[in-house]
Every structure is written in C-alpha cells, then in structure tokens.
C-alpha cells in the first residue's frame, strides 16, 4: 500500500566463511531524505520499548557514525536512493536475517534480507541440455549463486580431470535482481565422450581449489562398427568363398537392426552379423559394409573392397579422336575388363599385328592418310588371354591434295575476252564440296570447279583456285598474261620546269603507265593535225601561236589509246598595245574623252601606266583613262604601258585633239 517504503534487492544472499558479501540495494523513502540507518543481525521487535533488539552491525545517525563493526560492514548507499551494503570478511555466524532500519524525519521502516553463510565454499551447479547428440554443439553452463567485489573467484571446466581446450565465457551479475557467477562452454561432443565425467571447479583468484560439481556425459550416437573378412586381403578367384563379420564397438541407445550393403545398395535377406558368400562370381566384386541402426540413426562400418579375379574379357578399342586430321596426334585405348588388370597387350592394324606395341595405349604423334583403317587388340593377365573384339575404325581426314588451276582458253588472252579456268585436284577426304578463287570478282561459276571470267580486265594478272572440303587447299597462281592497249596515256611537260614563256625551249613527253605487248608507236596532234611520231614533242623557241590543245596517241598490236587534251599555255609580256579613243580622237572641250589601252598578254595585264606627250605619267593605273571635262590644253599625244608578271609593253603614240566649243568660239 501507499504507506510502504519501496525496496529492491536479492531476497537471499549466499557466501562462505572468510569470503565477502555484496548486497545490491535500492530504496525510496516515503518522505524526505534518510536521517538514520542501523543494520541489525536477526532483529526482533520489542513491544515494550517499541524498538528493535538485536546485534547492531552498522549504525549511522545525524550525529555521526557509531564505530561498532564499521570496518567489516560498509553502508555504500546514500540518503534517498542507494542502500547497497558490503560485509568483508563474512563469517559463519553472519547467517540469518539482516535488518535495515531506516528512519526519515517522520517515517520509519525495517527491511529484511536473508544471508546464508556456509562453513565451506558451496559447489557450483552444472546445467546440461536435456539430450546430447554426437557432433551437435551444446552449451554447458556452470552456475554459482555468489559474486562479491572483494573476493574474486574463477570457474574452470575439466573433462576426465583434464582442463578442456574450448574457451569458456564467464559472466557475473551483482544487481538488485540477482547475484551470481556463470561460466558457459560451447562444446561438440563425439561418441567417444559418452560416459565421460565433466567437472566445473570453483577456484579462488590464485587458482586454489574451493569446490566443484561433476556430471557424467550421456552422448547419444549411432552404432560404431568394425568389419572383419576372411580371407583378410579380400582377394579371391571366381568360385571361392568369402565370410564377413560385423562387430558393434559402441551404441547409445542399443542397436535395433542389422543389414549389409554392396556398392551402397542393401543386400536382401542379409540381417545377421555374418555375411557368407559362396562360389563368388566376378559380378560380386565391389565395396561391402555392414549397417546397424539405433534410435539416433544408422551407423556404417568401413568398406571392404572384395576383388574377384578373372581372365580378360573380349576387348574393345577407343580412339581419341576419329575422324583424325592429318598431322594431328591420335591415341588408341584397349579396353578389356579383367582382374587383375592386364599386363600385356597385342595390337592389330587392318588384321596385321603391330610390332612393338604392348601397352594399353598406342600413341601416334603425327597421323598420315595411310594410318586409316581398323584397329583391334588382345589383353592378357595372370589368369589368361582375352579375345580380340570387333575393333574400331580410324578415319584420317586431309585437305585436297595436288590442287592446280588450269586455263582452258587458247593463248594469248586479250582484254575483254571470256576466260574459262578449271580447278583440279588429286585426292581428298572428305570429298570436295566447294571451290574458292582469288582474287574475288563478280565472276560466273557455271559448274563446280569451273570459273568463267567475262570481259577479262587488263589487270587480271594471276588467278588461283582452292579446292575445299573441311579445309581449303590453294593452287599456285596461274598467270593470265592478258594483252591490252596502252593505258593511262597522258601529256607531261618535261621542260621548262616552271611556266612556259615565249621563246623558251619546250619538251612535251607522251607518257603511258603500261602496255602489253610492250612494243608501241606514238602520234602527236594539235587541232586534228599530225605533228610527230616520237615519244617527245620539242619546240626550240615557243611562240604564243604555239599555244593550244595538244593530244598524243600510243598504239600497240591490240589497239590505240589517246591522252586527254593538254593545254599548252605560253606566257608573254604585253604586246600589240594601242590606245583607242572614245568617242573618237577629236572631242569638243567640256565633254568626256575615254582613252583605252588595248593589248595582248598572258597572263593578263595587272596594271597600266599612262603618259602624255612629254612622257609624264598620269595618276591612273586602270585600262581606261577618263578625261572629264576635257580641255583644249589636253590635246596631244598619249601612250600607255601595260605590265604583267612576264614584263612590260608600250603602245605607239595616239593623238587626241580637243577643239573649242561653239560657246568659246562665240565668246572670242
């Protein structure tokens, strides 16, 4: 109810003589702070005095502390929350009830805590899971209802008296809810741990033994078996007898059933600890074991490999690989069931014994076409010789052999002809399925292995064919030797190296890139007129009149080819200059007179210079000189000079006459 003080602490604390006790404690007073605290041992209420009687272990008041046993007993609390206590060392006669007498300004309370002190250190308690199975990890717990800051302890695990290798995790609790020390050990027990003793040992800080708890492990496990065989090496011949015995070395719980297995499969009607095999056959060779079950599951013995020996069976040949490519390596393997394994082999190729081949494998590093055929073998062991089996076929594949390209046409071949070629070969495995031709072209293949080139080009120099099965074999190229008219005929200026000026010595060359046949003739023409029949056309001193369009022709026995027209340009200084006058050479004053300097020049005149009758230059550089308004004083002889990059040329004098106007005459 609301008139109670509220306390929290463990109900009972445990310790032993000479150890210590630590009492975690919290409280809440009804009003105000704590003013007086007395710790009683076994307090009893005295009705007469209305006070508690008993041994006072600790006392604390407003006035100060009463010494009593203050050194052994310590109040570690405060005036409003904490009431933690420590007794160090603790004695056997401290057992009983501790009474915490609390007084505030107006309220009082007696809180009781049980203390159990034993003469000797009490043992810890081992906790095991309800069931332990082999190889399944379990946690072993060792719990001790004791912990005190002033008295360190340790818990150690032992198996059959030997410290356990596994690391244990130790934890302590000193709270108002619980006081304990706990050690937890994770452990995967094996079947061999069954019945073994596990100990949790309590030790002081120095490792001195204080107490312990022990448990016997009950490890559930499948039956553990041993198998015995007669004869002991388990090697027999067909017709012999064999006995196998199964012994149980351990089982928890007890076993329930027995069975025998061969190569992992259960043998029917074999449910005893002895297996008798009479007059064994080679089919009974294999791996035998016994299986015994209990509630945990089945347990199996180790396997016994029973070998029933027999002479080799008829052999077969395995080829790695067929078909084989010529030049590759091939391995033949003779396969024959036998026990013991064959020690000697005889090999046959197309029924004929292969000398010096006595191994299980025959290796041919470089296969040739003649290696093709049937391969068979015979195996032999200590019990006899097997029979020769049907054998295996080796197919040797190779590219087409001796491929040739053959021209079917009569020679010589001319540009534009239709050429037929055939592709021939000697032998092939597998058969030829297609043909290839080099170079590629938009050519016809009227039938397999035949190529038709319509309108053969001048530059179709060589053709090669390939006959193809899985591979292509190329023939040596065959020369078509196509004859054609001269090609790429052009006019080339040999001299001068720069532009042609009037008066230069000029040489033109008629070039062509190729001709077949090589023998050629040349022709030069200008404007349809034949000029020469040499490869060069020469001018000792070129004149502007030689300028024009030139062509050359080259012919051989196949035909003739013309060059593109080539323009011969002759550069010359301005010539044939003359001054023309507009509207004429007689002009009335006040009007406009235009003088034009006419000329012939290559390149054209870049600028002109105008001169009067006193050879004085006028400030004009254009072709026309405009005088406006013209004056009578302008009458006189004028001339012009034209300039281009080659040089200068001058005109003769032209006279301009400026006459008076009627107005001027009228004024005189």
């Amino acid at each position: 109810d609301s008139s109670k003080w509220v306390f929290e602490h463990p109900e009972t604390l445990y310790a032993w003589e000479g150890a210590c006790v630590w009492i975690p404690c919290t409280y809440r007073a009804l009003d105000g702070d704590l003013e007086s605290f007395i710790l009683f041992h076994n307090p009893e209420y005295n009705k007469n005095t209305s006070k508690f009687d008993g041994t006072r272990l600790y006392e604390s008041t407003k006035d100060g502390k009463v010494p009593s046993e203050q050194k052994r007993v310590q109040f570690l609390g405060d005036k409003n929350k904490n009431c933690t206590l420590s007794i160090h060392p603790v004695h056997l006669n401290d057992s009983g009830q501790l009474g915490l007498r609390m007084e505030s300004k107006t309220e009082k309370w007696m809180e009781r805590i049980h203390l159990n002190v034993s003469e000797r250190p009490f043992p810890p308690h081992i906790q095991l899971p309800p069931e332990i199975q082999e190889s399944q990890e379990v946690t072993l717990t060792c719990l001790l209802n004791f912990s005190c800051y002033g008295y360190p302890i340790q818990l150690q695990w032992l198996l059959e008296g030997v410290p356990m290798r596994q690391a244990a995790v130790t934890s302590t609790s000193l709270t108002i809810k619980s006081v304990f020390t706990r050690s937890e050990l994770k452990f995967s027990p094996q079947w061999s741990h069954h019945g073994k003793i596990v100990t949790c040992q309590l030790q002081d800080a120095d490792g001195k033994f204080l107490s312990n708890d022990t448990v016997q492990l009950n490890v559930k496990h499948t039956p553990k078996l041993e198998i015995k065989v007669t004869p002991s090496d388990a090697i027999v011949r067909e017709g012999d007898s064999v006995t196998m015995t199964c012994e149980v070395s351990s089982s928890n719980p007890e076993y329930t059933t027995v069975s025998w297995l061969k190569d992992g499969t259960s043998l029917k009607k074999q449910n005893t600890f002895t297996l008798n095999l009479r007059e064994v056959t080679k089919d009974q060779s294999g791996k035998y074991c016994c299986q015994v079950s209990n509630d945990v599951g089945p347990g199996r013995s180790e396997e016994v490999f029973l070998q029933v020996q027999y002479a080799p069976e008829p052999s077969t040949v395995q080829i790695l690989h067929s078909p084989a490519v010529e030049g590759s390596q091939v391995e033949f393997l003779c396969m024959s069931l036998a026990n013991p394994l064959p020690t000697n082999y005889t090999w046959y190729h197309n029924g004929k014994e292969m000398q010096g081949r006595t191994e299980e494998k025959v290796h041919i590093p470089k296969i040739l076409p003649w290696h093709a055929g049937t391969y068979s073998c015979v195996a032999e062991n200590i019990l006899g010789t097997g029979q020769r089996g049907p054998g295996a076929e080796l197919d040797v594949q190779y590219p087409p052999k001796k491929v040739t390209t053959v021209i079917q046409n009569p020679m010589p071949i001319r540009e534009g002809d239709t050429v037929t070629l055939s592709c021939n070969y000697n032998s092939s495995n597998p058969s030829v399925t297609r043909y290839e031709w080099k170079p590629h072209g938009a050519w016809e293949e009227p039938s397999l292995g035949v190529l038709k080139i319509q309108n053969v080009g001048w530059d179709n120099t060589t053709i090669a064919c390939a006959a193809c099965n899985s591979w292509c074999s190329w023939a040596s190229p065959v020369a078509l030797n196509v004859q054609y008219a001269p090609r790429d005929v052009r006019v080339r200026k040999i001299k001068p190296l720069s532009e042609i000026h009037s008066g230069n010595s000029v040489s033109l060359q008629c070039d062509f890139s190729s001709s077949h046949p090589k023998e050629v003739q040349f022709f030069w023409e200008k404007n349809g007129r034949l000029l020469g029949k040499e490869s060069q056309l020469n001018f000792d001193s070129i004149s502007p009149e030689d300028a024009g369009s030139y062509s050359c022709w080259v012919n051989n026995s196949i035909g003739q080819t013309a060059s593109k027209a080539w323009t011969l340009e002759v550069l010359y200084a301005p010539r044939r200059l003359r001054v023309s006058m507009s509207p004429g050479d007689q002009v009335m004053e006040g009007k406009s007179a235009t003088l034009t300097c006419e000329s012939d020049a290559n390149p054209p005149v870049s600028h002109y210079t105008w001169f009067d009758w006193n050879n004085q230059s006028l400030p004009y550089h254009s072709q026309k000189l405009r005088l406006e308004p013209v004056k009578v004083q302008h009458s006189g002889a004028y001339w012009c000079q034209g300039t281009n990059s080659v040089g200068k040329g001058r005109s003769p004098l032209s006279t301009l006459t400026v006459y008076y106007s009627p107005e001027t005459i009228g004024r005189r």
Epitope: S617, P619, Y620, H621, S622, K624, G636
Partner: antibody
C-alpha cells in the same frame, strides 16, 4: 616639311556655295609628280573622295560622280594654293572637309574644316 | 566604282596582341592599296602605300600584304598609342575609294 593649311567658313546656308582654300607650303601646286585632293568625312558616309587637280604637261581635274555636277577644283599657281567650290549645298553636305597631297598615297593632309549646312 | 570592304568593323585587343585587318576590293587593283590610321579629331595618317611599303617614320610593327583583290594589314605587337580607326584606300583608278574603317579598342 610640306604643310597644308585650310581656310573657309564653317557654316553655309542651304542652296549656297561652299568655298574652301588649301594653302601649300614646302611643295608646289604645279609639281608634276603629285595630285591635290579634296576629301570629306561624315558619320553617315565615312571618308569620301570628292576630286583632285594635278599638273603634268597641263592641268587636269577628276571629280567623284556623286558631286560632278556641283564641284569645281582650281589651282592658283600665284598663291601656291588650290580651292574647292561646291554649289547648291544641302544638309547632306555637312561634314569635315580635308585637303590632301597624293604622291604614293595621301601622305600630307590639312587640319580639316568642319562645315555645317544649316 | 570600286567598292572597298573592310573587316572586322571593330575589334577589342590588349597591349602586346597581334592584330590583323583585311580589305577586299570589288575588282583587281593590282598593288595600288594604301592604309591609314585616324585618331579622334585628327586627319588620317598614311602608314602603308602600294600594299606593302612602309611610309617613312612609321614603326616597323605595322605591315601590309596582298595583291589583286585581297589585302591584309597587321600590327605585330599592339602598343597603347595604336588604339585608333584604320582605313584602306585604292589608288588604282578614279573615283578613289576608301574602306568603311576598323576601330581597334582596348579590351
């Protein structure tokens, strides 16, 4: 060194005649290796050549087509100067007027006269 | 009349920069092209005559090239006093004509 000194009114009334004179020092108006030019400059038309006079064996004149009907350039050998007359002026003739000597390019220029037609 | 087209009409540059101006004639004028510099309130000043000849007293950082219809004017390393307007002019035939000018301003 050659110098050109311009003179003439800065304000001319529309339809009147604009008259400017360019006095030459350090060269002769009758030199037979040069030409004497008039150029004007306005924001709307930039640099505009108006005409020139030059002496070779006689006197010659060249005029720009835009002013041909209104312009006269005369040399005055006695005063070693040359003049510009531009008739029937309009506000479009407002500009800075320059005289210049042309030998190889216009290498000597007058100081310029700002003429306003208003 | 021969039309002279100058480009660009204006450009911004810094002291030390290389500046190039082009001038194109509407027909061939051989090498009869002159270049002028004009500063505000002053008369034009001849820099280059006959396309590539440097006028007496003009610094060598100014140069010109070209013939026919296409011409170039270059200032190799712009100086503070070079900020001005530049004009080309043909003297091939009358009427003599000028380009529209290129104003070189400080960046």
């Amino acid at each position: 060194q050659v110098q050109l000194q311009q003179s003439g009114p800065g304000l001319v009334e529309p339809s009147q005649t604009l008259s400017l004179t360019c006095a030459i020092s350090g060269d002769s108006v009758s030199s037979d290796s040069v030409a004497w030019n008039w150029i004007r400059q306005s924001p709307s038309r930039g640099l505009e050549w108006l005409g020139r006079t030059y002496y070779r064996s006689t006197w010659y004149n060249d005029y720009a087509g835009s002013v041909k009907s209104r312009i006269t350039i005369n040399p005055d050998t006695s005063k070693n100067q040359f003049s510009l007359q531009l008739n029937s002026v309009t506000p479009e003739d407002t500009a800075v007027y320059y005289c210049a000597r042309d030998r190889n390019g216009m290498d000597v220029w007058g100081q310029g006269t700002m003429v306003t037609v208003s | 009349d021969i039309v002279m087209t100058q480009s660009p009409s204006s450009l911004s540059a810094s002291v030390g920069d290389r500046v190039t101006i082009t001038c194109r004639a509407s027909q061939s004028i051989s090498s009869y092209l002159n270049w002028y510099q004009q500063k505000p309130g002053k008369a034009p000043k001849l820099l280059i005559y006959d396309a590539s000849n440097l006028e007496t007293g003009v610094p060598s950082r100014f140069s010109g090239s070209g013939s026919g219809t296409d011409f170039t004017f270059t200032i190799t390393s712009l100086q503070p006093e070079d900020f001005a307007t530049y004009y080309c002019q043909q003297s091939y035939t009358t009427p003599l004509t000028f380009g529209g000018g290129t104003k070189v301003e400080i960046k």
